[in-house]
């Protein structure tokens, strides 16, 4: 009889499609958005009218498409009315305030910035790590990675002096944070309450 050959060994199917061998020939099952014998052709969804509603512009993408909506509309198909703060675009706990029909403003929590509070402010430029400590940024704070003979959040405590009085200055979790950071090399962020 004829010898069976795995036609899929040469990976003929493109763009994440699934290959199967039928009668020594490959067959490609394409992902949505691709076509052709080897799924090598991107389907231009924008050739089909009506994908984007309310005057939205269709933008073809590899394997998919995107609607660019006119002001006042939103959603995958521009089928929803745009309400600036519903849902809130503000991240990291920021509070959204509607400033106009189509505009908003995010009031960011301390330590964050950006139009949607998307950026954690780097607190290290103003650090005060003492005694050779190296700054590690946190959320609206920073911590210090200390050389072996120093400890504490800011490397102000001499290890040789022992832990007497440390609790006067540092909460247990800050000491724990420091030990994790220095001795295990973990870059934990200390969130203050």
């Amino acid at each position: 009889g004829s010898q069976w050959t795995d036609a899929c060994l040469s990976h003929p199917c493109a763009n994440g499609s699934t290959c199967t061998t039928v009668a020594n020939q490959f067959s490609c099952k394409c992902l949505t958005g691709f076509t052709g014998q080897k799924c090598e052709t991107d389907v231009n969804e924008c050739d089909i009218p009506g994908h984007c509603q309310h005057g939205g512009t269709c933008l073809n993408l590899p394997g998919s498409y995107q609607c660019q909506c006119l002001q006042g509309f939103t959603g995958q198909y521009c089928d929803s009315l745009y309400v600036p703060c519903a849902p809130s675009p503000c991240v990291n706990g920021g509070t959204c305030r509607q400033t106009g029909d189509f505009t908003f403003e995010c009031n960011c929590l301390p330590g964050f910035e950006g139009s949607t509070c998307e950026r954690n402010i780097d607190d290290c430029p103003n650090h005060r790590c003492q005694n050779g400590g190296v700054c590690v940024d946190g959320v609206n704070t920073y911590n210090c990675r200390c050389p072996p003979q120093w400890t504490g959040q800011f490397c102000t405590e001499d290890v040789d002096e022992g832990n007497s009085g440390l609790n006067d200055i540092f909460e247990a979790q800050k000491i724990e944070w420091h030990e994790n950071l220095y001795f295990q090399g973990h870059h934990h962020h200390h969130h203050h309450h």
């Epitope: 050779g132 102000t156 540092f170």
Partner: antibody, heavy 120, light 107 residues
């Protein structure tokens, strides 16, 4: 004994320049953050500039009121801290103190101060 | 910048009195607070660092306490040499900021 001695103060016209020096002794200069703090007559203390230690690459920070006008620097071989003051304004009139950041988030040693008067 | 609100701005007291000065910061400074004493024509002198640690050579009648945003300097029994101006200062981050000062005067 830790000692800091400032010099270089004096009378200067608005827009003029002056360079303050702070000679230190009694400690390893490069191990410590060094600060300049000023005090106008009858007023409170105002931080001006800082230079971190060798472990922090001698990085520098300025107050907003002097940024781009003042320059802090140090010469480890002479154990001296400097403050170059340019484009001086009448509101820069004050006693200028050099101080050592003692490794405890506090300024544990201060110089005697040097008076800078900016007036026409 | 971290704002420092020091109060009172002045206090009249007698020798032997207990004097309390407070300092409030605009954000958590993690006990990175120092207290200084300054006499007329003299440089400031460090009294307390780390909110509660007594600097070497400072009499034990001076004490500091507090955490977060609220800090206190206490002089347990005022002595004649304690009449001066006191400043708090945060050392948590640059720019370093000082309180407005508290003048302790003789009643």
């Amino acid at each position: 004994e830790v000692q800091l001695v400032e010099s270089g103060g004096g009378l200067v016209q608005p827009g003029g320049s002056l360079k303050l020096s702070c000679a230190v002794s009694g400690f390893t200069f490069s191990d410590f953050y060094m600060e300049w703090v000023r005090q106008a007559s009858g007023k409170g203390l105002e931080w001006v500039a800082a230079q971190r230690n060798k472990a922090n690459d001698f990085s520098i920070v300025y107050s907003a009121s002097v940024k781009d006008r003042f320059t802090i620097s140090r010469d480890d071989s002479k154990s001296t801290l400097y403050l170059q003051m340019n484009s001086l304004k009448t509101e820069d009139t004050a006693v200028y103190y050099c101080s050592r950041d003692g490794g405890r988030l506090a300024l544990d040693a201060w110089g005697q101060g040097t008076l800078v008067t900016v007036s026409s | 910048d971290i704002q420092m609100t020091q109060s009172p701005s002045s206090v009249s007291a007698s020798v032997g009195d207990r004097v309390t000065i407070t300092c409030q910061t605009s954000e958590d400074i993690y006990s990175g607070l120092a207290w200084y004493q300054q006499k007329p024509g003299k440089s400031p002198k460090l009294l307390i660092y780390g909110a509660s640690r007594l600097q070497d050579g400072v009499p034990s009648r001076f004490s500091g306490s507090g955490s977060g945003t609220d800090y206190t300097l206490t002089i347990s029994s005022l002595q004649p040499e304690d009449f001066a101006t006191y400043y708090c200062q945060q050392g948590f981050k640059y720019p370093l900021t000082f309180g407005g000062g508290t003048k302790v005067e003789i009643k």
